[in-house]
């Protein structure tokens, strides 16, 4: 008995073929011995079947001796044993219909879990293999469940069905709701402005939603909220903004926020979060400011660090075009009486510059001028 | 696993440079700086300096000021440690390490033999 | 410059015995930003390049077995094999990387009595 394997809402064709290569009286029927379809004459007949206005054939290939079965909108229940009878002959084919779908909204956020579930046939035992957009392979039974979905998990996942060594394909594409960024840092001088932008890794027609920012500065003892928003099909409107400091938020996305000045006060991590209209959970985005400043108090020339640092990281003092007068893993570093000149401080992380300053050191009788 | 693989041994005359070659090869070049240090025979560890390969900045210890000179070629992932002015007080094994502020892979070393 | 100073120069044990290699620092190696002292232990055999036993002073690179460990804070750091094996001969150096230049002790020869 030949398998055919079949997908929920495809189309599926069975082939019947005689050995005369010529029109010739021909029945499809059902393990019940209900007739599906068959032909008399050049003309289609269709039995009292459930199949009847899904059942159809293909009358051009008549002639050759090809009387294929096609089934259209394939249902579960549809599989079945389908017989041909021509010529005195029983052609009998096993049609196994499966159908895969995702137990929830194909689009998820970033962290939830994924269950696929597969419709098959009573008497089946078919087994599943999935591959991720990012390559990662899962197997499993009826159900299969991927937690703590990431990022790189957004796209087509292509799974597999095995069946009587037979196997079918399915694709479903599954959108992950996230940030494009789990954690960012922004690295600035005292004074600067400063921009936090937070980009979006989905794109949808309508998006709604609401979101703040929470921040934790590393010289206060609490969090506080910085700002409040709400979004209207991907509009951007301000509910409600803290007063030191005066943040600004942009009227469209990608969700931009700017902070007049770095100042050591501000320094610390926030943590952006954003509840979209018809979903459960949130999506965050960590993001980090160290701040630096470079001052000469009399004889002490100091370079400072605010903010959430990597203890890999080298803070340095040095006269431009020289070697490093002072090199530490500090947050904190001088030189007592600088000779005069234009003086870097650098903050580094294996040898790449994350942030710059710089203070001239004028000779003893001046004062020092920042540029 | 990222892997540094060292130029072969060099015998230089004084006076002369040498250009020692360190290649990465199976991980990410540019992440960490590379720092050299060298042994001279029957001697103890001495770090001459670093260089960033994704920057290209670099530092050097006080003594070899002026001597030496760290660059590096990104489309091979290799740096070069360059000492000129040879004395032969440099014969030495000189060896380039992943700086990951610990030195937690080391190429397998270069011995430079400096004599007349 | 922080320099670095072993003690002994070398040591004899027993296998299966206990050894303690000393090392001090002329600065503190201790962050105060940071609270991590930045100080490594490295293993030597003749003709190889070293090899990272301990970061943090105390922290065992993977792969190292346990019977290497590290302690102290500051200027005062102990490395200690718990049971010295025949594959353990070797120098063993002490590393500062708090600032630069980093600067190794001058080494700590251990061999079996």
């Known amino acids: 008995k030949k398998v055919v394997l079949g997908k929920k809402g495809d189309t599926v064709e069975l082939t019947c073929t005689a050995s005369q290569k010529k029109s010739i009286q021909f029945h499809w029927k059902n393990s019940n011995q209900i007739k599906i379809l068959g032909n008399q004459g050049s003309f289609l007949t269709k039995g009292p079947s459930k199949l009847n206005d899904r059942a159809d054939s293909r009358r051009s290939l008549w002639d050759q001796g090809n009387f294929p079965l096609i089934i259209k909108n394939l249902k579960i229940e549809d599989s079945d044993t389908y017989i041909c009878e021509v010529e005195d002959q029983k052609e009998e084919v096993q049609l196994l219909v499966f159908g895969l779908t995702a137990n929830s909204d194909t689009h998820l956020l970033q962290g939830q879990s994924l269950t696929l579930t597969l419709e098959s046939p009573p008497g089946s035992s078919p087994s599943v293999q999935c591959r991720s957009p990012r390559g990662k392979n899962i197997q499993g039974g009826k159900t299969l469940s991927v937690s703590q979905l990431e990022l790189q998990d957004s796209g087509t996942w292509t799974c597999t069905v095995l069946q009587n060594q037979k196997k079918v394909e399915f694709k479903i594409d599954i959108v992950v709701l996230a940030f494009q960024k789990a954690s960012s840092i922004v690295y600035k001088k005292e004074g600067e402005q400063v921009e936090f932008s937070f980009p979006l890794a989905f794109t949808v027609e309508k998006l709604t939603g609401s979101g703040e920012l929470w921040w934790q500065a590393e010289r206060a003892s609490s969090s506080k909220s910085w700002i409040t928003f709400d979004l209207k099909n991907k509009e951007v409107s301000v509910k409600r903004v803290t007063q030191d400091p005066k943040l600004q938020m942009g009227k469209k996305l990608p969700l931009h926020l700017t902070l007049p000045q770095a100042l050591p006060q501000y320094a610390g991590s926030g943590n952006l979060t954003l509840a979209l209209e018809a979903k459960t959970g949130k999506l965050h985005q960590e993001v980090n400011l160290v701040v630096m400043r470079a001052t000469q108090l009399q004889k002490n020339l100091t370079c400072e660090v605010w903010g959430p640092t990597s203890p890999k990281l080298m803070l340095s003092l040095k006269l431009e075009n020289k070697e490093a007068k002072v090199s530490k893993r500090e947050k904190a570093v001088w030189v007592l009486n600088p000779e005069a000149g234009m003086w870097q401080c650098l903050l580094s992380d294996s040898g790449q510059v994350l942030l710059e300053s710089n203070i001239k050191v004028l000779p003893t009788w001046s004062t020092p001028v920042q540029p | 696993q990222v892997q540094l693989v060292q130029s072969g041994a060099e015998v230089k005359k004084p006076g002369a440079s040498v250009k020692v070659s360190c290649k990465a090869s199976?991980?990410?070049?540019?992440?960490?700086?590379i720092s050299w240090v060298r042994q001279a025979p029957g001697q103890g560890l001495e770090w001459m300096g670093w260089?960033?390969?994704?920057?290209?900045?670099?530092g050097y210890a006080q003594k070899f000021q002026g001597r030496v000179t760290m660059t590096r070629d990104t489309s091979t992932s290799t740096v070069y440690m360059e000492l000129s002015s040879l004395r032969s007080e440099d014969t030495a094994v000189y060896y380039c390490?992943?700086?990951?502020?610990?030195?937690?892979?080391w190429g397998q070393g270069t011995m430079v033999t400096v004599s007349s | 410059d922080i320099v670095m100073t072993q003690s002994p120069d070398s040591l004899a044990v027993s296998l299966g015995e206990r050894a303690t290699i000393n090392c001090k620092s002329s600065?503190?190696?201790?962050?105060?930003?940071?609270?991590?002292?930045?100080l490594a232990w490295y293993q030597q055999k003749p003709g190889q390049p070293p090899k990272l036993l301990i970061y943090?002073?105390?922290s065992r690179q993977s792969g190292v077995p346990d019977r290497f460990s590290g302690s102290g804070s500051g200027t005062d750091f102990t490395l200690t094999i718990s049971s010295l094996q025949a594959e353990d001969v070797a120098v063993y150096y002490c590393?500062?990387?708090?600032?630069?230049?980093?600067?190794f002790g001058q080494g700590t020869k251990v061999e079996i009595k």
């Open positions: 390490a992943r700086d990951s502020g610990a030195f937690d892979i």
């Open positions: 199976g991980g990410t070049f540019s992440s960490y700086a």
């Open positions: 260089m960033s390969p994704n920057s290209g900045n670099t």
């Open positions: 600065q503190s190696v201790l962050s105060s930003s940071y609270n991590k002292n930045y």
């Open positions: 943090w002073a105390s």
């Open positions: 590393q500062q990387y708090y600032s630069t230049p980093l600067t």
